[in-house]
Amino acid sequence: GITNINCSGHIWVEPATIFKMGMNISIYCQAAIKNCQPRKLHFYKNGIKERFQITRINKTTARLWYKNFLEPHASMYCTAECPKHFQETLICGKDISSGYPPDIPDEVTCVIYEYSGNMTCTWNAGKLTYIDTKYVVHVKSLETEEEQQYLTSSYINISTDSLQGGKKYLVWVQAANALGMEESKQLQIHLDDIVIPSAAVISRAETINATVPKTIIYWDSQTTIEKVSCEMRYKATTNQTWNVKEFDTNFTYVQQSEFYLEPNIKYVFQVRCQETGKRYWQPWSSLFFHKTPETVPQVTSKAFQHDTWNSGLTVASISTGHLTSDNRGDIG
């Protein structure tokens, strides 16, 4: 950076090198060049010479004034015009930054994704600060009072093996940067209450062409949690509103859910689950598409590997991978 150059004098910023965005700031340059009484002092911002708001303070010092400085980062340097020197002589340089103090972190959430071995904590950091902002996640046992702190710049994964102070904890987040420090409210958690079951996945769908055509959705999860509540939402791809069906589920076998749908329409399905009575849901599963047959069964679009079985009596769709969910982060 600009701060690594050899200086023949010095440059400083008031009120500080890192300051609140929108402030008025002054940049001072003081020359200390051998055998040079500077004729003129020049300021450069990001390599471009500044023309206005420069005041000569004395023989060796000048000030550059900025009103309402809004740039997150800038490289400043200053030079001197010395008699008998053809080129300007570099005095010194400095990187400056503007931004905001952190907001109070809120919406602190900690979950344990089944089989992950981690407790994942996230929060709403608030408005963009533009400057380096660090977060310290505090985890304090309600049983032993032992506290652990984790430094991060975003979310944090904490190994559940390191949580040795029992099952009950307080979690809070401290945000700090050069302009200020704020702290969230404390979140009380019980490790058994924040587990999110292993992801539920829709594996295939088939429409049976009975008197009233019936679509069966096959879905499963590797969870070992006994009491699981799930929601499946579905809609025609042309619709805005979802229909939601609720299930109390036992994943000892593949789930089969029946739907009576309109013929010759492309539908999209998603599923999510939670441990019954607990707070947090899985994110919605990947989008699963299925096109119902016309009254006479037909093969559906190859793009989603739809196949036809049972001598024309069924139309089936197989999941081929992961199209992202429209709100994959929904754990509330």
Epitope: K140, L142, E146, Q148, Q186, Q188
Partner: antibody, heavy 121, light 112 residues
Framework: EVQLVESGGGLVQPGGSLRLSCAAS?????????MCWVRQAPGKGLEWVSC?????????YYANWAKGRFTISRDNSKNTLYLQMNSLRAEDTAVYYC????????????WGQGTLVTVSS | DIVMTQSPLSLPVTPGEPASISCQAS??????LAWYLQKPGQSPQLLIY???KLAAGVPDRFSGSGSGTDFTLKISRVEAEDVGVYYC??????????????FGQGTKVEIK
């Protein structure tokens, strides 16, 4: 058994500086721990000054009135806690105690004997 | 800022009789409260932590109770050696940007 021994107290003029030390033994400096400074003005109650948390990173905490004037630090190689006190005032006259439980809790099983700081002209 | 308020500030006691000191926090501190006794000319010593747990070597005539904002230290039968100043301390968190003190003002216990 944890032992804490403070030193560095004495008479200092208003506006002056002083650095207090607390030599600790019996603490596992490789684990997470809090170490703190607490002071007591003559005839007054206990007043929290500052704490340092040492774990995978180091974090420092100060009473509102101590921010900007006092700095807590530690030297693990010397098993020593420090309190650098600048811009001292007459109201900073007190016995300064070093305190810890030797772990990452904020109650104090162990206290030093205290070191007296007198700020006077 | 969490403020700790003790009452009474002075407590004359009769040896053999029970005594009780109250400590109130200005916000929820769960069970994160400690009690100390400072005998004349000595450093403070920990009596109770986590609101109700007896520190090592402390006689069982001392007991603590409470959670949230209201806490009590009880001495079942006061002895002459129990005189001194008792302090409560919140041990919840010191990372809050606006903490002035974490101790109560102290309760002076003396023999009648």
């Amino acid at each position: 058994e944890v032992q804490l021994v403070e030193s560095g107290g004495g008479l200092v003029q208003p506006g002056g500086s002083l650095r207090l030390s607390c030599a600790a033994s019996g603490i596992d400096f490789n684990s997470n721990y809090y170490m703190c400074w607490v002071r007591q003005a003559p005839g007054k109650g206990l007043e929290w000054v500052s704490c340092i948390y040492v774990g995978s990173h180091v974090n420092t905490y100060y009473a509102n009135w101590a921010k900007g004037r006092f700095t807590i630090s530690r030297d693990n190689s010397k098993n020593t806690l420090y309190l650098q006190m600048n811009s001292l005032r007459a109201e900073d006259t007190a016995v300064y105690y070093c305190a810890t439980s030797g772990s990452s809790v904020l109650y104090f099983k162990f206290w030093g004997q205290g070191t007296l700081v007198t700020v006077s002209s | 800022d969490i403020v700790m308020t003790q009452s009474p500030l002075s407590l004359p006691v009769t040896p053999g009789e029970p005594a009780s000191i109250s400590c109130q926090a200005s916000e929820n501190i769960y069970s994160f409260l400690a009690w100390y006794l400072q005998k004349p000319g000595q450093s403070p010593q920990l009596l109770i932590y986590s609101a109700s747990k007896l520190a090592a070597g402390v006689p069982d005539r001392f007991s603590g109770s409470g959670s949230g904002t209201d806490f009590t230290l009880k001495i079942s039968r006061v002895e002459a050696e129990d005189v001194g100043v008792y302090y409560c301390q919140q041990t919840n968190r010191y990372s809050n940007p606006d903490i002035y003190n974490v101790f109560g003002q102290g309760t002076k216990v003396e023999i009648k």
